[in-house]
């Protein structure tokens, strides 16, 4: 026998209180698939999060981060502080890259300059905190 709830489309839930008819999700909730017995609470983009896409009856809200922060984790589950190029984020905040390392982005860690001699090349342009070395012939 076919489950009557399978006829309930996204945006509704199968309502046991009404003989399993399909009822619309309450405001601030959604169901992204058919046949659900409850709807899900919409994600709230608050604080350092801001709304990239509003919640609808069939899809959850999507958040990104306010300026000065960037997303981390699946679905932007966290916001991490931006640093300047030439810096990396530590427990004590943004710190300049140590000599011999660089970071050309506002996120991530400082990475060592390329060792040109490993490829039998010489340094054409010196590295900085913000840029890798350029190797030449």
């Amino acid at each position: 026998l076919q489950d009557p709830c399978s006829n309930c489309p996204a945006g509704t839930f199968c309502d046991n209180n009404r003989n399993q008819i399909c009822s619309p999700c309450p405001p601030n909730s959604f169901s992204s698939a058919g046949g659900q017995r409850t709807c899900d609470i919409c994600r709230q983009c608050k604080g350092v999060f801001r709304t990239r896409k509003e919640c609808s009856s069939t899809s959850n809200a999507e958040c990104d981060c306010t300026p000065g922060f960037h997303c981390l984790g699946a679905g932007c589950s966290m916001c991490e502080q931006d640093c300047k190029q030439g810096q990396e984020l530590t427990k004590k905040g943004c710190k300049d890259c140590c000599f011999g390392t660089f970071n050309d982005q506002k996120r991530g860690i400082c990475r060592p300059w390329t060792n040109c001699s490993l490829d039998g090349k010489s340094v054409l342009v010196n590295g900085t905190k913000e840029r890798d070395v350029v190797c030449g012939p």
Partner: nanobody, 122 residues
Framework: EVQLLESGGGLVQPGGSLRLSCAAS????????VGWVRQAPGKGLEWVSA????????YYAESVKGRFTISRDNAKNTLYLQMSSLRAEDTAVYYC???????????????RGQGTQVTVSS
């Protein structure tokens, strides 16, 4: 036991006004997410308006924005829907609804009353 008793419906001409009331018992309207759903003839249920403490906001369906106003009287434990500039398409049975948040994270709603019929016709 949760009970919801709707009243205030009736026959009104297009452009007219009505105020629906929902007297609640078994729970406190000021501490819950509550609202109004309606069912037009031959159609499914539709959310009209709600007061949502979870989202800290008031919800209105696009079709009623600027015409309907939801409110509650905590002392009387009653929910209201002030309806103005009524249109033929507002004809429906209106039910008071209580949003239910389940332990597993799911959301549904209850309508325990019989509803109140609103008919907009000249």
């Amino acid at each position: 036991e949760v009970q919801l008793l709707e009243s205030g419906g009736g026959l009104v001409q297009p452009g007219g006004s009505l105020r629906l009331s929902c007297a609640a018992s078994g729970f406190t309207v000021s501490a819950e997410d509550v609202g109004w759903v309606r069912q037009a003839p031959g159609k499914g249920l539709e959310w009209v308006s709600a007061i949502l403490d979870f989202g800290g906001s008031t919800y209105y369906a696009e079709s009623v924005k600027g015409r309907f106003t939801i409110s509650r009287d905590n002392a009387k434990n009653t929910l209201y829907l002030q309806m103005s500039s009524l249109r033929a398409e507002d004809t429906a049975v209106y039910y008071c609804a209580r949003v239910v948040y389940h332990a597993g994270g799911g959301v549904t709603f209850d309508t325990r009353g019989q509803g109140t019929q609103v008919t907009v016709s000249s």
